[in-house]
């Protein structure tokens, strides 16, 4: 969480951003809130990016003002128009690109003053893993698949029964480049699986951590997946 203040006493307002991550090819949100104004006409929101000449986005006097917008963001940005009046300056970024990563500034002017805060935005790819029993294998085998990751993640297996056990010797992980030549499909196979146990396939890079669990008993198979972004720090 980053909290920024404007310059000098009563002419400053508090602006708060939260560091976040974007999943390339999907829509992302750059989060920013500010002390709200009572009327829309005096609110100006400017999003800027370090190293980019034009603006990322500008909203003023109740509407988007995109004449100074940088070409790389053309047609890809929007504020939540109904929430500006209550202090939400968050920016929706469509079709996140790898090159969207960097330091952004959320700059706010209201009738009460000015303020700004920076935001670190990471980009990559992350997806939920799915763990299945591989019935084609000669022994009891689990297969963990996740369709899109970047940068290349690490994959670690764990088990509820054998806590702390190292499964690297009995697992095999491969990374297959997807058609867009950036993200990769992650496939990890775990051999010599025992029945009545819960196994976890944990995939992690510097942006996200995802876990796929599978519980295998004689009568049923239960699955659960979970994904968490690692760098959601507020400013």
């Amino acid at each position: 969480l980053i909290i920024g203040f404007g310059i000098s006493g009563r002419h400053s307002i508090t602006v708060t951003t939260v560091a976040s991550a974007g999943n390339i090819g999907e829509d992302g949100i750059l989060s920013c809130t500010f002390e709200p104004d009572i009327k829309l006409s005096d609110i100006v929101i400017q999003w800027l990016k370090e190293g980019v000449l034009g603006l990322v986005h500008e909203f003023k006097e109740g509407k988007d003002e995109l004449s100074e917008q940088d070409e790389m963001f053309r047609g890809r940005t929007a504020v939540f128009a109904d929430q500006v009046i209550v202090g939400n300056a968050s920016l929706r970024l469509k079709n996140v690109q790898l090159t969207d990563a960097g330091t952004y500034k959320c700059y706010i002017i209201t009738s009460k003053g000015k303020g700004n805060a920076n935001l670190e935005y990471k980009t990559g790819a992350f997806s939920m893993p799915e763990v299945n029993v591989d019935y084609n294998a000669s022994s009891e085998t689990l297969r963990c698949e996740a369709p899109r990751w970047f940068p290349q993640p690490t994959v670690v297996w764990a088990s509820q029964v054998d806590q702390g056990a190292n499964f690297s010797e009995v697992s095999n992980t491969s990374f297959e480049l997807n058609s867009e030549n950036v993200t990769m499909k992650v496939v990890s196979v775990l051999y010599n699986v025992t029945i009545n146990n819960t196994y976890s396939c944990m995939i992690e890079n510097d942006i996200a951590k995802a876990t796929g669990d599978i519980k295998v008993t004689e009568s049923e198979i239960k699955r659960r997946s979970h994904l968490q972004l690692l760098n959601s720090k507020a400013s």
Epitope: S41, G62, V84, I85, K112
Partner: antibody, heavy 115, light 107 residues
Framework: EVQLVQSGAEVKKPGASVKVSCKAS????????MNWVRQAPGQRLEWMGG????????EYNEKFKGRVTLTVDTSASTAYMELSSLRSEDTAVYYC????????WGQGTLVTVSS | DIQMTQSPSSLSASVGDRVTITCKAS??????VAWYQQKPGKAPKLLIS???YRYTGVPSRFSGSGSGTDFTFTISSLQPEDIATYYC?????????FGGGTKVEIK
């Protein structure tokens, strides 16, 4: 659940003052504007002003400036609207309403000004 | 001050009818218009903010459109529980101002 609970009905003499309270719960009181709106019988809704508890910023409708005073007690999450020099045309239901979208309203307080 | 002129002041329609209310601002308010529903003896309730955004929990039969000075509020299929007075309001500049209201009744 957001709730705004206002004080009870008041009967006042012309020239007197009235102070209406609005107790907020279910959200962070200091981070939203609190507006005051009145509705005289058969009249349109009329915005009187708003206060931002976190900073004490106040915006008044010029029509009421000098007669209306908006205050807050942040420790009690309560907003107050005081209207002075009352006249018969101030007879109305007075509402508090949360944030700049007026997303939640109090139940209203009837103020009757009569000699 | 920005005047908000609402019309009609009252209307009567049948259940299932499409109902349209208009609101005209005396100057450009961009899209800073909200619509409220008020039932007799009750406080107003926010239905639509920023011209067209339905507030949380508001049924999809309520919608809004417009920009600049001309705004429209629509009930696509009137229900018995929609009997109320509807108000437009601008939050573009202070003083914040409301329309005169439209009383909706069932035929």
């Amino acid at each position: 659940e957001v709730q705004l609970v206002q004080s009870g009905a008041e009967v006042k003499k012309p020239g007197a003052s009235v102070k209406v309270s609005c107790k907020a719960s279910g959200y962070t009181f200091t981070s939203s504007w609190m507006n005051w709106v009145r509705q005289a019988p058969g009249q349109r809704l009329e915005w009187m002003g708003g206060i931002y508890p976190n900073r004490g910023n106040i915006e008044y409708n010029e029509k009421f400036k000098g007669r209306v005073t908006l205050t807050v007690d942040t420790s009690a999450s309560t907003a107050y609207m005081e209207l002075s020099s009352l006249r018969s045309e101030d007879t109305a239901v007075y509402y508090c309403a949360r944030d700049s979208r007026f997303s939640y309203w109090g139940q209203g307080t009837l103020v009757t000004v009569s000699s | 001050d920005i005047q908000m002129t609402q019309s009609p002041s009252s209307l009567s329609a049948s259940v299932g009818d499409r109902v349209t209310i208009t609101c005209k601002a005396s100057q450009d308010v961009r899209t800073a218009v909200a619509w409220y529903q008020q039932k007799p003896g009750k406080a107003p309730k926010l239905l639509i903010s920023s011209t067209s955004y339905r507030y949380t929990g508001v049924p999809s039969r309520f919608s809004g459109s417009g920009s600049g000075t001309d705004f429209t509020f629509t009930i696509s299929s009137l229900q018995p529980e929609d009997i109320a007075t509807y108000y437009c309001q601008q939050h573009y500049s202070t003083p914040l101002t409301f329309g005169g209201g439209t009383k909706v009744e069932i035929k």
